[in-house]
Protein backbone atom coordinates (compact mmCIF):
# COMPACT_ATOMS: atom_id res chain seq x y z
CA UNK A 1 0.00 0.00 0.00
CA UNK A 2 1.60 3.31 -1.02
CA UNK A 3 2.27 5.63 1.91
CA UNK A 4 0.11 8.80 1.94
CA UNK A 5 2.17 11.86 1.28
CA UNK A 6 1.21 15.45 2.10
CA UNK A 7 0.62 17.46 -1.09
CA UNK A 8 1.86 21.02 -0.76
CA UNK A 9 1.08 23.90 -3.09
CA UNK A 10 4.68 24.78 -3.91
CA UNK A 11 7.26 23.02 -6.09
CA UNK A 12 9.17 20.15 -4.53
CA UNK A 13 12.82 20.01 -3.52
CA UNK A 14 15.19 20.91 -6.33
CA UNK A 15 16.44 17.75 -8.00
CA UNK A 16 19.88 16.60 -6.87
CA UNK A 17 19.60 18.99 -3.92
CA UNK A 18 22.22 17.30 -1.66
CA UNK A 19 24.73 17.05 -4.50
CA UNK A 20 24.09 20.67 -5.52
CA UNK A 21 24.62 22.04 -2.03
CA UNK A 22 27.78 20.00 -1.52
CA UNK A 23 29.19 20.96 -4.95
CA UNK A 24 28.42 24.64 -4.37
CA UNK A 25 30.11 24.51 -0.99
CA UNK A 26 33.26 22.95 -2.44
CA UNK A 27 33.35 25.48 -5.28
CA UNK A 28 32.81 28.44 -2.93
CA UNK A 29 35.49 27.40 -0.47
CA UNK A 30 37.97 26.88 -3.31
CA UNK A 31 37.33 30.38 -4.69
CA UNK A 32 37.24 32.19 -1.32
CA UNK A 33 40.47 31.59 0.62
CA UNK A 34 39.00 32.94 3.86
CA UNK A 35 36.48 30.06 3.84
CA UNK A 36 38.91 27.24 2.98
CA UNK A 37 38.74 25.95 6.55
CA UNK A 38 35.06 25.04 6.09
CA UNK A 39 34.28 21.31 6.04
CA UNK A 40 31.60 20.99 3.36
CA UNK A 41 30.40 17.59 4.56
CA UNK A 42 29.72 19.12 7.98
CA UNK A 43 27.93 22.03 6.28
CA UNK A 44 25.69 19.62 4.40
CA UNK A 45 25.01 17.61 7.56
CA UNK A 46 24.01 20.80 9.39
CA UNK A 47 21.86 21.95 6.48
CA UNK A 48 20.14 18.57 6.30
CA UNK A 49 19.65 18.50 10.06
CA UNK A 50 17.69 21.75 9.91
CA UNK A 51 14.75 20.24 8.01
CA UNK A 52 15.01 16.45 7.66
CA UNK A 53 12.45 14.51 9.76
CA UNK A 54 10.74 17.78 10.73
CA UNK A 55 7.30 18.96 9.78
CA UNK A 56 7.89 21.42 6.93
CA UNK A 57 5.45 23.92 8.44
CA UNK A 58 7.12 23.88 11.82
CA UNK A 59 10.68 24.99 11.09
CA UNK A 60 12.32 27.54 13.39
CA UNK A 61 15.39 29.76 13.20
CA UNK A 62 16.89 27.60 15.94
CA UNK A 63 16.84 24.64 13.54
CA UNK A 64 19.32 26.51 11.35
CA UNK A 65 21.69 27.61 14.13
CA UNK A 66 24.23 24.78 13.61
CA UNK A 67 24.40 25.72 9.90
CA UNK A 68 24.68 29.42 10.75
CA UNK A 69 27.61 28.67 13.05
CA UNK A 70 29.47 26.66 10.42
CA UNK A 71 28.80 29.32 7.78
CA UNK A 72 29.93 32.27 9.89
CA UNK A 73 31.64 34.68 7.53
CA UNK A 74 32.97 38.21 7.76
CA UNK A 75 32.23 40.49 4.83
CA UNK A 76 33.19 44.18 4.87
CA UNK A 77 30.25 45.63 6.76
CA UNK A 78 30.36 48.90 4.78
CA UNK A 79 30.18 47.15 1.40
CA UNK A 80 26.79 45.48 1.70
CA UNK A 81 24.26 45.61 -1.14
CA UNK A 82 20.71 44.59 -0.32
CA UNK A 83 18.14 44.14 -3.08
CA UNK A 84 14.44 43.63 -3.59
CA UNK A 85 12.74 42.18 -6.66
CA UNK A 86 15.80 42.81 -8.82
CA UNK A 87 18.16 39.98 -7.92
CA UNK A 88 19.77 39.38 -11.32
CA UNK A 89 20.91 42.97 -11.75
CA UNK A 90 22.20 43.14 -8.17
CA UNK A 91 24.22 39.98 -8.78
CA UNK A 92 25.54 41.26 -12.10
CA UNK A 93 26.65 44.39 -10.30
CA UNK A 94 28.58 42.65 -7.52
CA UNK A 95 30.22 40.37 -10.07
CA UNK A 96 31.74 43.54 -11.52
CA UNK A 97 32.02 45.63 -8.38
CA UNK A 98 33.99 42.98 -6.53
CA UNK A 99 34.25 44.97 -3.32
CA UNK A 100 30.47 44.93 -2.76
CA UNK A 101 28.50 41.96 -1.52
CA UNK A 102 24.94 40.70 -1.72
CA UNK A 103 23.72 37.96 0.59
CA UNK A 104 24.14 35.50 -2.28
CA UNK A 105 27.84 36.38 -2.45
CA UNK A 106 28.27 34.84 1.02
CA UNK A 107 28.67 31.10 1.51
CA UNK A 108 25.21 30.44 2.96
CA UNK A 109 23.44 32.63 0.41
CA UNK A 110 25.40 31.05 -2.41
CA UNK A 111 24.52 27.53 -1.23
CA UNK A 112 20.78 28.12 -1.24
CA UNK A 113 20.26 30.62 -4.07
CA UNK A 114 17.36 29.59 -6.31
CA UNK A 115 16.94 26.23 -4.56
CA UNK A 116 13.87 24.71 -2.87
CA UNK A 117 13.92 22.05 -0.17
CA UNK A 118 11.77 20.38 2.45
CA UNK A 119 11.46 17.11 4.29
CA UNK A 120 8.69 15.16 5.97
CA UNK A 121 7.79 14.70 9.60
CA UNK A 122 9.29 11.54 11.12
CA UNK A 123 10.99 10.28 7.95
CA UNK A 124 14.51 10.89 6.69
CA UNK A 125 13.24 11.43 3.17
CA UNK A 126 13.56 14.63 1.17
CA UNK A 127 10.28 15.62 -0.49
CA UNK A 128 10.92 16.03 -4.20
CA UNK A 129 7.20 16.16 -5.06
CA UNK A 130 6.05 19.35 -3.31
CA UNK A 131 6.99 21.79 -0.58
CA UNK A 132 4.89 24.34 1.34
CA UNK A 133 4.12 27.60 -0.38
CA UNK A 134 4.67 30.66 1.83
CA UNK A 135 1.21 32.11 1.08
CA UNK A 136 -0.96 29.07 0.40
CA UNK A 137 0.45 26.68 3.01
CA UNK A 138 2.61 28.15 5.77
CA UNK A 139 5.29 30.74 6.40
CA UNK A 140 7.45 28.62 8.72
CA UNK A 141 8.66 26.38 5.92
CA UNK A 142 12.31 25.39 5.49
CA UNK A 143 13.10 27.80 2.64
CA UNK A 144 11.35 30.86 4.10
CA UNK A 145 12.83 30.37 7.54
CA UNK A 146 16.30 29.91 6.07
CA UNK A 147 16.14 33.18 4.12
CA UNK A 148 14.62 35.02 7.06
CA UNK A 149 17.47 33.79 9.27
CA UNK A 150 20.36 34.58 6.92
CA UNK A 151 18.80 37.88 5.85
CA UNK A 152 18.43 39.01 9.44
CA UNK A 153 22.05 38.15 10.21
CA UNK A 154 23.28 39.85 7.03
CA UNK A 155 21.39 43.06 7.86
CA UNK A 156 22.58 42.99 11.46
CA UNK A 157 26.19 42.85 10.25
CA UNK A 158 25.88 45.94 8.04
CA UNK A 159 27.53 49.26 8.92
CA UNK A 160 28.19 52.79 7.63
CA UNK A 161 26.41 53.29 4.28
CA UNK A 162 24.23 50.37 3.20
CA UNK A 163 22.92 50.27 -0.38
CA UNK A 164 19.70 48.65 -1.54
CA UNK A 165 18.81 48.08 -5.18
CA UNK A 166 15.07 48.42 -5.87
CA UNK A 167 13.06 47.68 -9.01
CA UNK A 168 11.54 50.90 -10.34
CA UNK A 169 9.44 48.95 -12.85
CA UNK A 170 7.25 47.36 -10.18
CA UNK A 171 4.01 48.84 -8.88
CA UNK A 172 5.42 48.67 -5.35
CA UNK A 173 9.01 49.82 -5.64
CA UNK A 174 9.37 49.22 -1.91
CA UNK A 175 7.27 46.31 -0.68
CA UNK A 176 6.84 45.93 3.07
CA UNK A 177 6.16 42.22 2.54
CA UNK A 178 9.42 41.49 0.73
CA UNK A 179 12.38 40.03 2.60
CA UNK A 180 14.00 43.44 2.44
CA UNK A 181 10.89 45.18 3.73
CA UNK A 182 9.92 42.69 6.41
CA UNK A 183 13.30 41.50 7.66
CA UNK A 184 16.35 43.47 6.54
CA UNK A 185 14.99 46.98 7.06
CA UNK A 186 14.10 46.15 10.66
CA UNK A 187 17.42 44.53 11.46
CA UNK A 188 19.79 47.28 10.35
CA UNK A 189 21.51 48.46 13.51
CA UNK A 190 21.16 52.25 14.04
CA UNK A 191 24.30 52.34 16.19
CA UNK A 192 26.31 50.96 13.25
CA UNK A 193 24.44 52.06 10.11
CA UNK A 194 24.64 55.74 9.25
CA UNK A 195 22.72 55.79 5.96
CA UNK A 196 20.57 53.52 3.83
CA UNK A 197 20.93 54.57 0.19
CA UNK A 198 18.31 53.23 -2.21
CA UNK A 199 19.18 52.79 -5.86
CA UNK A 200 15.90 52.83 -7.79
CA UNK A 201 16.59 51.15 -11.10
CA UNK A 202 14.49 52.49 -13.97
CA UNK A 203 13.33 50.19 -16.74
CA UNK A 204 15.07 52.38 -19.30
CA UNK A 205 16.30 55.89 -19.98
CA UNK A 206 12.93 56.86 -21.45
CA UNK A 207 11.39 56.77 -17.98
CA UNK A 208 12.61 60.12 -16.69
CA UNK A 209 10.30 60.34 -13.67
CA UNK A 210 11.80 60.93 -10.25
CA UNK A 211 10.96 57.56 -8.74
CA UNK A 212 12.49 58.64 -5.45
CA UNK A 213 9.22 60.57 -5.03
CA UNK A 214 7.21 57.36 -5.21
CA UNK A 215 4.86 56.89 -2.21
CA UNK A 216 6.42 53.53 -1.35
CA UNK A 217 9.88 55.14 -1.25
CA UNK A 218 8.50 57.81 1.07
CA UNK A 219 7.16 54.96 3.22
CA UNK A 220 10.63 53.37 3.29
CA UNK A 221 12.16 56.72 4.19
CA UNK A 222 9.70 57.07 7.07
CA UNK A 223 10.48 53.59 8.43
CA UNK A 224 14.23 54.15 8.19
CA UNK A 225 14.12 57.65 9.68
CA UNK A 226 12.10 56.42 12.65
CA UNK A 227 14.92 53.97 13.28
CA UNK A 228 17.40 56.89 13.48
CA UNK A 229 19.11 55.94 10.22
CA UNK A 230 19.57 58.53 7.48
CA UNK A 231 17.94 57.79 4.14
CA UNK A 232 19.07 58.68 0.64
CA UNK A 233 17.57 57.73 -2.71
CA UNK A 234 19.04 57.86 -6.22
CA UNK A 235 17.44 57.37 -9.62
CA UNK A 236 19.52 55.01 -11.77
CA UNK A 237 18.58 55.27 -15.44
CA UNK A 238 20.89 53.02 -17.39
CA UNK A 239 20.89 49.44 -16.13
CA UNK A 240 22.32 48.27 -19.46
CA UNK A 241 25.60 49.82 -18.37
CA UNK A 242 26.16 46.97 -15.93
CA UNK A 243 26.05 44.61 -18.88
CA UNK A 244 28.90 46.52 -20.49
CA UNK A 245 30.96 45.97 -17.38
CA UNK A 246 30.02 42.31 -17.21
CA UNK A 247 31.40 42.03 -20.74
CA UNK A 248 34.52 44.04 -19.94
CA UNK A 249 35.08 44.00 -16.16
CA UNK A 250 38.79 44.82 -16.32
CA UNK A 251 38.14 48.27 -17.71
CA UNK A 252 39.14 50.99 -15.25
CA UNK A 253 35.71 52.60 -15.43
CA UNK A 254 34.15 49.35 -14.21
CA UNK A 255 36.41 48.85 -11.22
CA UNK A 256 36.55 52.29 -9.62
CA UNK A 257 35.41 52.34 -6.03
CA UNK A 258 31.87 53.06 -4.90
Amino acid sequence: VPRWRQQWSGPGTTKRFPETVLARCVKYTEIHPEMRHVDCQSVWDAFKGAFISKHPCNITEEDYQPLMKLGTQTVPCNKILLWSRIKDLAHQFTQVQRDMFTLEDTLLGYLADDLTWCGEFNTSKINYQSCPDWRKDCSNNPVSVFWKTVSRRFAEAACDVVHVMLNGSRSKIFDKNSTFGSVEVHNLQPEKVQTLEAWVIHGGREDSRDLCQDPTIKELESIISKRNIQFSCKNIYRPDKFLQCVKNPEDSSCTSEI
Epitope: F93, V96, Q97, W199, H202, G204, R205, E206, D207, S208, R209, D210, C212, Q213, S232, C233, K234, N235, I236, Y237, R238, D240, K241, F242, Q244, C245, K247, N248, D251, S253, C254, S256, I258
Partner: antibody
Framework: QVQLVESGGGLVQPGGSLRLSCAAS????????MSWVRQAPGKGLEWVSA????????YYADSVKGRFTISRDNSKNTLYLQMNSLRAEDTAVYYC?????????????WGQGTLVTVSS | DIELTQPPSVSVAPGQTARISCSGD??????VSWYQQKPGQAPVLVIY???NRPSGIPERFSGSNSGNTATLTISGTQAEDEADYYC?????????FGGGTKLTVL
Amino acid sequence: QVQLVESGGGLVQPGGSLRLSCAASGFTFSDYAMSWVRQAPGKGLEWVSAIRYDGSNTYYADSVKGRFTISRDNSKNTLYLQMNSLRAEDTAVYYCARYYSGIYQHIDYWGQGTLVTVSS
Amino acid sequence: DIELTQPPSVSVAPGQTARISCSGDNIGHYYVSWYQQKPGQAPVLVIYGDNNRPSGIPERFSGSNSGNTATLTISGTQAEDEADYYCASDVGSLDVFGGGTKLTVL
Protein backbone atom coordinates in the same frame (compact mmCIF):
# COMPACT_ATOMS: atom_id res chain seq x y z
CA GLN B 1 44.88 55.33 -22.82
CA VAL B 2 41.43 56.51 -23.89
CA GLN B 3 41.51 58.79 -26.93
CA LEU B 4 38.62 60.49 -28.72
CA VAL B 5 39.40 62.52 -31.85
CA GLU B 6 36.67 64.55 -33.52
CA SER B 7 36.69 65.64 -37.16
CA GLY B 8 34.32 67.06 -39.76
CA GLY B 9 33.77 70.53 -38.36
CA GLY B 10 33.93 73.65 -40.47
CA LEU B 11 31.98 76.54 -41.93
CA VAL B 12 28.51 75.81 -43.26
CA GLN B 13 25.62 78.01 -44.42
CA PRO B 14 22.30 78.11 -42.54
CA GLY B 15 20.09 75.25 -43.72
CA GLY B 16 23.14 73.23 -44.69
CA SER B 17 24.40 69.87 -43.45
CA LEU B 18 27.55 68.54 -41.83
CA ARG B 19 28.66 65.14 -40.57
CA LEU B 20 30.95 64.94 -37.56
CA SER B 21 33.03 61.86 -36.81
CA CYS B 22 34.75 60.72 -33.64
CA ALA B 23 37.50 58.11 -33.80
CA ALA B 24 37.85 56.20 -30.55
CA SER B 25 40.87 54.25 -29.33
CA GLY B 26 42.38 52.88 -26.13
CA PHE B 27 39.22 51.09 -24.98
CA THR B 28 36.62 48.61 -26.23
CA PHE B 29 34.38 51.05 -28.07
CA SER B 30 31.49 48.60 -28.49
CA ASP B 31 31.12 48.35 -24.70
CA TYR B 32 30.35 52.01 -24.07
CA ALA B 33 27.50 54.44 -24.49
CA MET B 34 28.69 57.63 -26.19
CA SER B 35 27.47 61.18 -26.57
CA TRP B 36 27.94 64.56 -28.18
CA VAL B 37 28.13 67.73 -26.10
CA ARG B 38 28.51 71.20 -27.56
CA GLN B 39 29.72 74.58 -26.36
CA ALA B 40 28.80 77.81 -28.10
CA PRO B 41 31.53 80.47 -28.08
CA GLY B 42 31.82 81.96 -24.58
CA LYS B 43 28.90 79.86 -23.34
CA GLY B 44 28.40 76.76 -21.20
CA LEU B 45 28.23 73.05 -22.03
CA GLU B 46 25.06 71.73 -23.66
CA TRP B 47 24.32 68.02 -23.99
CA VAL B 48 23.24 67.23 -27.55
CA SER B 49 22.74 63.51 -28.02
CA ALA B 50 23.60 60.03 -26.72
CA ILE B 51 23.63 56.50 -28.09
CA ARG B 52 23.64 53.14 -26.36
CA TYR B 53 26.70 50.93 -26.61
CA ASP B 54 25.02 48.70 -29.19
CA GLY B 55 23.30 51.54 -31.06
CA SER B 56 19.84 50.25 -30.20
CA ASN B 57 18.67 53.46 -28.53
CA THR B 58 19.37 57.11 -29.29
CA TYR B 59 18.53 60.24 -27.32
CA TYR B 60 18.41 63.92 -28.27
CA ALA B 61 18.11 67.34 -26.71
CA ASP B 62 14.88 69.09 -27.72
CA SER B 63 16.91 71.79 -29.49
CA VAL B 64 18.23 69.30 -32.09
CA LYS B 65 15.50 66.68 -32.24
CA GLY B 66 14.46 65.94 -35.82
CA ARG B 67 17.53 67.68 -37.27
CA PHE B 68 20.48 65.75 -35.84
CA THR B 69 21.10 62.00 -35.99
CA ILE B 70 23.62 60.17 -33.82
CA SER B 71 24.99 56.82 -35.00
CA ARG B 72 27.96 54.56 -34.50
CA ASP B 73 29.96 51.93 -36.35
CA ASN B 74 31.42 49.60 -33.76
CA SER B 75 33.49 47.78 -36.39
CA LYS B 76 35.27 51.07 -37.13
CA ASN B 77 35.33 52.37 -33.53
CA THR B 78 33.65 55.52 -34.76
CA LEU B 79 30.82 57.74 -33.53
CA TYR B 80 28.95 60.06 -35.89
CA LEU B 81 26.68 63.09 -35.70
CA GLN B 82 24.74 63.93 -38.86
CA MET B 83 23.59 67.56 -38.61
CA ASN B 84 20.91 68.81 -41.02
CA SER B 85 18.97 72.08 -41.30
CA LEU B 86 21.73 73.86 -39.43
CA ARG B 87 21.01 77.19 -37.75
CA ALA B 88 23.23 80.00 -36.53
CA GLU B 89 22.57 78.90 -32.94
CA ASP B 90 24.18 75.52 -33.70
CA THR B 91 27.55 77.27 -33.94
CA ALA B 92 29.73 75.65 -31.28
CA VAL B 93 32.64 73.40 -30.46
CA TYR B 94 31.28 69.84 -30.58
CA TYR B 95 32.80 67.35 -28.16
CA CYS B 96 32.60 63.59 -28.48
CA ALA B 97 32.37 61.99 -25.05
CA ARG B 98 32.30 58.53 -23.45
CA TYR B 99 29.92 57.48 -20.69
CA TYR B 100 31.14 55.74 -17.58
CA SER B 101 29.91 52.16 -17.38
CA GLY B 102 28.84 51.60 -13.80
CA ILE B 103 26.21 52.59 -11.28
CA TYR B 104 27.19 56.23 -11.61
CA GLN B 105 26.00 58.03 -14.68
CA HIS B 106 28.39 60.54 -16.15
CA ILE B 107 30.82 61.33 -18.94
CA ASP B 108 34.34 60.28 -18.00
CA TYR B 109 36.36 61.10 -21.15
CA TRP B 110 36.10 63.92 -23.68
CA GLY B 111 37.67 64.59 -27.05
CA GLN B 112 39.33 67.92 -27.81
CA GLY B 113 36.37 69.09 -29.88
CA THR B 114 35.72 70.25 -33.43
CA LEU B 115 34.39 73.72 -34.29
CA VAL B 116 31.19 74.04 -36.31
CA THR B 117 30.39 77.53 -37.61
CA VAL B 118 26.97 78.18 -39.18
CA SER B 119 27.04 81.48 -41.00
CA SER B 120 26.16 83.00 -44.34
CA ASP C 1 12.76 68.40 -16.74
CA ILE C 2 15.26 69.35 -14.06
CA GLU C 3 17.29 72.54 -14.44
CA LEU C 4 20.67 73.00 -12.76
CA THR C 5 21.57 76.49 -11.61
CA GLN C 6 25.09 77.63 -10.74
CA PRO C 7 26.40 81.05 -9.67
CA PRO C 8 28.16 82.71 -12.64
CA SER C 9 31.29 83.43 -10.63
CA VAL C 10 33.03 82.62 -7.36
CA SER C 11 36.20 84.25 -6.05
CA VAL C 12 38.58 82.79 -3.49
CA ALA C 13 41.96 83.70 -2.04
CA PRO C 14 44.78 81.16 -2.49
CA GLY C 15 44.80 78.59 0.28
CA GLN C 16 41.17 79.27 1.19
CA THR C 17 38.15 77.05 0.58
CA ALA C 18 36.01 77.57 -2.52
CA ARG C 19 32.45 76.31 -2.62
CA ILE C 20 30.48 76.14 -5.86
CA SER C 21 26.78 75.33 -5.63
CA CYS C 22 24.53 73.59 -8.12
CA SER C 23 20.84 73.81 -7.35
CA GLY C 24 17.95 71.91 -8.87
CA ASP C 25 14.63 70.47 -7.79
CA ASN C 26 15.42 67.38 -5.70
CA ILE C 27 18.91 67.17 -7.18
CA GLY C 28 19.74 64.93 -4.21
CA HIS C 29 17.76 62.19 -5.98
CA TYR C 30 20.30 62.15 -8.81
CA TYR C 31 24.03 61.52 -8.92
CA VAL C 32 25.94 64.67 -9.78
CA SER C 33 29.30 64.97 -11.52
CA TRP C 34 31.57 68.01 -11.79
CA TYR C 35 33.82 69.07 -14.66
CA GLN C 36 36.71 71.53 -14.74
CA GLN C 37 37.37 73.38 -17.97
CA LYS C 38 40.33 75.66 -18.61
CA PRO C 39 40.38 78.10 -21.57
CA GLY C 40 40.80 76.39 -24.93
CA GLN C 41 40.69 72.91 -23.38
CA ALA C 42 38.18 70.08 -23.15
CA PRO C 43 36.38 69.54 -19.83
CA VAL C 44 37.95 67.21 -17.26
CA LEU C 45 35.99 65.10 -14.78
CA VAL C 46 36.87 66.08 -11.20
CA ILE C 47 34.00 64.53 -9.18
CA TYR C 48 31.51 61.78 -10.04
CA GLY C 49 28.71 60.09 -8.12
CA ASP C 50 28.31 63.15 -5.85
CA ASN C 51 31.57 62.73 -3.93
CA ASN C 52 34.04 60.44 -5.72
CA ARG C 53 37.34 61.57 -7.20
CA PRO C 54 38.77 59.96 -10.34
CA SER C 55 42.39 58.91 -10.08
CA GLY C 56 44.74 61.82 -10.62
CA ILE C 57 42.40 64.44 -9.17
CA PRO C 58 43.85 66.07 -6.03
CA GLU C 59 42.29 65.34 -2.64
CA ARG C 60 41.41 68.99 -2.17
CA PHE C 61 38.43 68.42 -4.51
CA SER C 62 35.33 67.00 -2.84
CA GLY C 63 31.59 66.99 -3.41
CA SER C 64 28.30 66.65 -1.58
CA ASN C 65 24.68 66.42 -2.67
CA SER C 66 21.41 66.43 -0.77
CA GLY C 67 18.02 68.08 -0.99
CA ASN C 68 18.04 70.73 -3.68
CA THR C 69 21.76 71.55 -3.72
CA ALA C 70 24.95 69.83 -4.80
CA THR C 71 28.24 71.46 -3.83
CA LEU C 72 31.78 71.23 -5.15
CA THR C 73 34.32 72.12 -2.47
CA ILE C 74 37.95 72.95 -3.20
CA SER C 75 40.00 73.10 0.03
CA GLY C 76 43.28 74.99 -0.01
CA THR C 77 42.55 76.42 -3.44
CA GLN C 78 45.57 76.84 -5.69
CA ALA C 79 46.16 79.21 -8.61
CA GLU C 80 45.96 76.27 -11.03
CA ASP C 81 42.36 75.65 -9.93
CA GLU C 82 41.22 78.82 -11.69
CA ALA C 83 38.81 77.56 -14.36
CA ASP C 84 35.16 77.13 -15.28
CA TYR C 85 33.31 74.44 -13.35
CA TYR C 86 30.16 72.66 -14.52
CA CYS C 87 27.84 70.37 -12.59
CA ALA C 88 25.94 67.72 -14.53
CA SER C 89 23.42 64.98 -13.94
CA ASP C 90 21.70 62.21 -15.89
CA VAL C 91 17.94 62.71 -15.88
CA GLY C 92 16.41 59.88 -17.84
CA SER C 93 16.58 60.39 -21.57
CA LEU C 94 18.84 63.43 -21.36
CA ASP C 95 21.86 64.76 -19.53
CA VAL C 96 21.66 68.18 -17.92
CA PHE C 97 24.54 70.60 -17.36
CA GLY C 98 24.57 73.59 -15.08
CA GLY C 99 25.36 76.96 -16.63
CA GLY C 100 28.90 76.92 -15.29
CA THR C 101 30.78 78.89 -12.64
CA LYS C 102 33.97 80.84 -13.27
CA LEU C 103 36.30 80.32 -10.31
CA THR C 104 38.76 83.16 -9.85
CA VAL C 105 41.74 82.67 -7.54
CA LEU C 106 42.57 86.16 -6.31
